[in-house]
Structures are given as C-alpha cells and as structure tokens.
C-alpha cells in the first residue's frame, strides 16, 4: 500500500516536474523573444528623399524618390513615390514664352512641397535634365536653349528644396541611365541569391535586361552584348557597380523618337505630293488635318527633306493602311550604308542582340493603349492587330476613345507601326527574339526611365564595390540567436534530468 | 575637350575642285552643326553655309548655292566642304565652326590658294 | 541679309587704356528676347576666338576686361584695361538669320 502510495507520488512529482518545465520554458521563449524583439524594434527610419525632372520634348514629369538613409548603398531600396505630370508641352516648346515657365512648373513643385516632410525640404536635391527636345534646340541654337534652361533654374532655385541644376543630358546618359534604372529596379545588380521572386520578368540569373527607351523626339537603346569588344567606342560605355564590371553599348538616334519620326514621314512624303492634300497610310480612313508647312520644317529633323513648296499648307488624309504605313516608315531608315560588321540604321554600329530587353516609356504607353503588351501576344499577332487596328475608320475610333484626346488618338497608328518597324527593321528583332522584349511601364512601383538612374548616380547610391554587409540582418541575427539559445538551455535541462536521475525520470511513463 | 583639326593646305588650278576636312572629337558629333566661313587675306570673315550632321541637311549663302557641297561621315565625326569651279578669288583660308548660332569652336583653318 | 557695320576701322589705345568698338546691324538682331549678337578676336595666322556671345555673355576663358552691351541694331565691346595680348583684330557677327554675316574688324593697336 505504502510502495503504491509512493510510486502515485513519484509520478504526479514526474509528470508535474515536466509540466512546469514545459511551462517554464515556454513562458522563457516568450519573454525572450518580446526582449529579442523589443530590444531590435527599428528606430524610427531616416528617410531620404530626392526630387528629378523629366524634361522631354512632349511633356516634363517630376518624379520624387524615397529611401532609408542607412541603407543608401544597398540595391533596390529607392523607390518612387509619386509622379506628377506637368500640365503643358515640353520646356523647348516655352522659347517664345519663358516668362511662363515659372506657372509652368508650379503645380508639380507645390506637390513635391506636400508629399515631402517639411523638416526635409532644405537637404531633398532637385534634378532637372532635359533631353532631346532641347538637344534640338541647342542645335538651332545655344542661345535660346540657354534662355530656357536659366529660367528654368530661377524658377527652381525659388524652392525650399536644395536644388542641383539643370542641364541638358547626352543621349549617352539617357541610354545608360534607362539601362541602370530598370536593372537596379529589377534586382540585377544584387549579388545574393533569393530564395524566391517578387519582381515580375526576373529570372534567378543575374544576366542584365537591355533598356529600350523612346520618346518623343529621341530613342536609345543600351544592353551588354556578348562580345565585349566593340568596334565603335562612341557606344561603348564600362561601369563598375556593387563590384561587377559591365560593358555596355548604347546609342540614341536624335529625331527617332515617334513625334520627329512622324514630322520626318510628312516631309519626306510631302516632297512627292503632286498637290496640297497628302493621303496618308498612318492615319485612320477619314481622318483629315492641316498641317502648315513652317512648322514642318521648324526642327532640324526634317531638314534633310526641306525644299521650296508651291503652298503654306497642306491637308492631311488618313487611308488607313499598314503595310503602306511601314513601307512609309522604313524609307526613314537608311540601311544601305554600314561601315561596321553589323549597323542598326544611318551606318550607326549594333552588336549583336543579346538577352532579354525592357521597353518602356513610349514603347510602353503606345503598345499599352494598343492592348499588345502581353508576353504571349507574338510579333505576328501585333502586326495583325496593327493591320486592324489602322484601317478602322476614324469616325469609329473617335467613338471606341470617347476619352481620349483626338491628338493623340490619331496617332496610334503610326506610332504603333513605327515602333513594330524600327524594333524590327531598325534594331534587327525577329519573331522569334520579340518574345524577349518585355512592355514594361512600371517595375515595383516606380517608373521604367532614365530619372531613378541619374539621381541614383548623381546622390552617389550606386557604389562600384560591393558593399561590405552581414548575411543576417541584425534583428534577424538576435532573433536566431535567442531561439537557439533557448533551444539549447531546455534541451540542456533535460539532458541534465534524464542523466542524474534516468529512472525517478522515466518511472511509469513507459 | 572639343577639338576641329582641319585636313592641309592645297593649290589648285582654276576650274578645279576643292574638297576640305573637318574631323571633330570630344562631343557627340550629330549633337551640333557644323558651319564653315572662309577669309580672303585681309577680308573680313565670310559665312558659307551649314550642315546638319545627323541627317546631312544643309542650308548656304546664296553665293555659294550650286559651287559648294557639305557632307558628313557620322562613323569618322568629319564634315567636308567641297567648293567647285574655283577661280582665283576663292583663294583663302577656310575654316570650320561648331555652333547653332555661336560658333565657340573653329578648326586651325586651311588655306586653298588658286592659281593658274 | 543683314549689313553688320562696324566702327572704327582701326584703333590705337594705350596699355591700361580703355578700348570701345562698335557695331551698327542693317536690322534687329533681337529674337525672342535674345540678341544673337556675338564679338571674336583673331590674331594673325590664327581662327576667331569667340569674345561675347548674345551680345552681352562671356565666352568660356575670356578675361573680364572683356564686356559687351547693346540691343537691337547697336552694339559695344569694352575692353575696360588694354593688354600688350589684345592686340588683334575683332569681327561683330550676327546669327539671328540665314546668312550669318561679319562685320569688317577692328584693328586694335597699342598707342
């Protein structure tokens, strides 16, 4: 009676004794984990902001950028977190009015003095860059691109933020800083290796994505090309980023991008017109508009095709058909002169294509309102919808877009045409590598385009090396630590059980 | 640092042909037009004419319409002006200038002098 | 085309002296708000130097003794304190339209 009362009490003392362990352990992991925890809540994060200005030859966009100060030199951390459009042509557009380049911008700048933190004002640099509408300007002449640009940066300079300049970038610049925005944003220039994909188009390799800008007056294209020797050292460019070399090609065709290439097209066409009335393939059948013949040779884009003209204007007459359209378009690119291996058009140098590529801004905008930026949408399924697409009337088309500006809306036509054909005739893509073009417009939230790149590279966030860091991040590091601590103490404690008492341990739980 | 290095001096024969290099570097070539003025001795300086070097468009004085050619070749960075039908009054130096409309760099010049 | 006369023909100052040349154009040179008057210094044997550009603007490494002024049709380069170095000849110019065209020069001398 007395050996079974005893062995009752060894059992409920045995059972007990492990209940209060088990508890105790627990209630150590929790206490541990909220001081692990507690102890590694982030500081309130020092944010970082950084204001560009997009001034194109259509439009000028601002665009404002945040990241955590403390992780500057880290990839992917930039992101943008607003986009404003400003209301009004292109600062090239304002020669004949600088007065209102100030109104102008004003919108935008009130914006940027919302979305940023006041007590962040004063150190947020502003960036302006201007890009091919003033490089065609400069070209008729310094003094007026000038007069802009000072106006411009008066304007600016009236701004709490602290403001860097403005400046007319190269075609080099654009090209390389499209090719560095959507790569950062990507995540191709990190070297750790993710376990799993957030970004949409990215493969687990590290292989960069070739940039494809276009815009209104220019178009660049920037990839590495397997070959590292080049036989153009215009287009060559080498960076070192995060501790990789990359050498890259680029190059920006001046009076390419889809607005000057449709100027070119109505003064090549023009020269051959027997009268005033141009019937045009790019327009939709029934479309019709004046053109004035000095505004057609106001950019020096046109003037390779500039003659004497019996007639101030002429008339515009959509007929609505593709294949003409292209047959049109590709006059504008010369193919018959190549002093290199290989050339795009105009005897300028193209290796060969490599890799996938990123199509963005106006290759994006136009193939998006076409409905043609699925991945599994072919280059002979867009030529057809292309085809369609154009010989719809525009009665009909006006009525589909209800919402959309005739302007625009007219010009789809060759704008999609145009990019089909210079994707493929002028930058030598087939059917088979179109599926390696990828219509992106925004990668993570932020704008495809050359602005993230050139603030990233004029605030010095892109380091040549790569930046020397732990594989844990700190609060990561702690928790781990913890866990494994507490892991080894509870199965210390029992190891310590089960060794000095073995069988008082193990009785009746058998 | 942008440079226009001229091709030499010639001589040349009335009715003969000229034809004048300019190679440019340190720029974007098709970036900026490329015009060319010549200066009899002791003449004041003559404006010619113009080329666009990204789509070789050109515009000239009237006085040269129909005598003097600009070319490019984008891959070299180099105008050419060809003046044709020279006779001894065309005997100068000529020089070429990149600008729109502020001609801030000239090549060193290149003098043709005609003689029969 | 517009006419670019310029005034004097020749001038001698002496070294420290202040040096004015002037240049009259047949027409306006203005153009939104711009003067596209520019000024350039040629020595012997050697191309024009670009002095002033839209009438009034430094070029990149000109001395500011150098200064332009004026507006319309009249136009002035100062050279504030003549240097033994400024000895040369100088060309007004318009670009306001096609054909661009000089002035006669200025021949500058030391007195």
């Known amino acids: 009676m007395e050996d079974t009362k005893e062995s009752n009490v060894k059992t409920f003392c045995s059972k007990n004794i492990l209940a209060i362990l088990g508890f105790s352990s627990i209630i150590a992991v929790i206490a541990l984990l909220a001081v692990g925890l507690t102890q590694n809540k982030a500081l309130p994060e020092n944010i970082k902001y950084g204001i560009v200005l997009d001034a194109g030859s259509s439009h000028t966009s601002l665009y404002i950028y945040k990241w955590p100060a403390e992780k500057e030199n880290d990839t992917g951390v930039v992101h943008q977190v607003e986009e404003c459009r400003v209301k009004g042509p292109g600062i090239s557009k304002y020669v004949q009015k600088v007065n209102e380049i100030g109104i102008y911008l004003t919108d935008c700048m009130e914006r940027a003095r919302e979305v940023i933190p006041r007590s962040q004002h004063q150190e947020t640099p502003v960036y302006l860059g201007a890009t091919a509408g003033m490089r065609l300007l400069r070209m008729e002449s310094e003094e007026l691109a000038d007069r802009v640009l000072d106006v411009v940066e008066r304007s600016l300079s009236n701004y709490p933020f602290d403001f860097q300049g403005a400046r007319i970038i190269t075609g080099q610049e654009e090209g390389a800083y499209g090719w560095i925005t959507i790569n950062y944003l990507l995540g191709k220039f990190s070297q750790k290796t993710r376990w799993f994909s957030i970004v949409p188009y990215e493969t687990n390799n590290q292989e960069t994505f070739g940039a494809l800008d276009l815009g209104g007056a220019s178009t660049q294209i920037t990839f590495v090309p397997q070959n590292q020797t080049t036989e153009s050292p215009d287009n060559a460019l080498q960076f070192r980023l995060y501790g990789k070399d990359y050498n890259v090609y680029t190059h920006s065709f001046l009076c390419y991008g889809k607005d000057q290439a449709l100027w070119q097209k109505l003064a090549k066409d023009i020269q051959v017109a027997s009268n005033e009335i141009l019937r045009d393939p790019c327009f939709h059948p029934g479309y019709k508009k004046v053109v004035n013949v000095s505004d057609l040779y106001k950019t020096p884009c046109t003037k390779r095709f500039e003659m004497t003209l019996p007639f101030q204007q002429f008339e515009i007459q959509g007929i609505g058909n593709y294949q003409q359209c292209h047959q049109s378009v590709l006059e504008l690119f010369n193919t018959s002169y190549c002093p290199y291996s290989q050339c795009a058009f105009n005897g300028i140098f193209l290796p060969p294509l490599q890799g996938d590529f990123g199509a963005f801004s106006a290759f994006y905008f136009v193939m998006n309102f076409l409905n043609l930026t699925s991945e599994k949408v072919s280059q002979e399924k867009v030529t057809e919808m292309m085809k369609k697409f154009c010989s719809q009337p525009w009665e009909e088309i006006k009525t589909s877009y209800a919402g959309v500006k005739e302007k625009y809306l007219s010009e789809y036509c060759f704008s999609g045409t145009y990019i089909l054909s210079l994707l493929l005739q002028g930058y030598h893509f087939t059917a088979d590598s179109w599926e390696h073009i990828h219509f992106i417009g925004k990668i993570q939230g932020s704008d495809a385009g050359w602005t993230l790149g050139y603030m990233l590279n004029l605030t010095n966030m892109i380091p040549a090396e790569q930046p020397l860091s732990t594989p844990l991040s700190h609060s990561t590091y702690v928790f781990l630590m913890v866990l494994f601590s507490l892991v080894l103490v509870i199965v210390a404690i029992i190891g310590l059980l089960i060794f000095h008492k073995p069988s008082y341990f193990w009785k009746d739980m058998v | 640092q942008v440079q226009l290095v001229q091709s030499g001096a010639e001589v040349k024969k009335p009715g003969a042909s000229v034809k004048v290099s300019c190679k440019a570097s340190?720029?974007?070539?098709?970036?900026?037009?490329m015009h060319w003025v010549r200066q009899a001795p002791g003449q004041r300086l003559e404006w010619m004419g113009y080329?666009?070097?990204?789509?070789?468009?050109?515009t000239f004085s009237q006085k040269f319409k129909g005598r003097a050619t600009i070319t490019v070749d984008t891959s070299a960075s180099t105008a050419y002006m060809e003046l044709s039908s020279l006779r001894s009054e065309d005997t100068a130096v000529y020089y070429c200038?990149?600008?729109?409309?502020?001609?801030?760099?000239w090549g060193q010049g290149t003098l043709v002098t005609v003689s029969s | 085309d517009i006419v670019m006369t310029q005034s004097p023909d020749s001038l001698a100052v002496s070294l420290g002296e202040r040096a004015t040349i002037n240049c009259r154009a047949s027409?306006?040179?203005?153009?939104?708000?711009?003067?596209?008057m520019y000024w350039y210094q040629q020595k012997p044997g050697q191309p024009p130097k670009l002095l002033i550009y839209?009438?009034?603007n430094q070029g990149s490494g000109v001395p500011d003794r150098f200064s332009g002024s004026g507006s319309g049709t009249d136009f002035t380069l100062t050279i504030s304190s003549l240097q033994a170095e400024d000895v040369a000849v100088y060309y007004c110019?318009?670009?306001?339209?096609?054909?661009?065209?000089f002035g006669g020069g200025t021949k500058v001398e030391i007195k």
């Open positions: 200038a990149r600008g729109g409309t502020r001609f801030a760099y």
């Open positions: 340190g720029y974007t070539f098709t970036d900026y037009n």
């Open positions: 080329i666009v070097p990204l789509n070789g468009g050109s």
């Open positions: 027409e306006s040179v203005d153009n939104f708000g711009v003067s596209f």
């Open positions: 839209g009438a009034s």
């Open positions: 110019q318009q670009t306001k339209e096609v054909p661009y065209t």
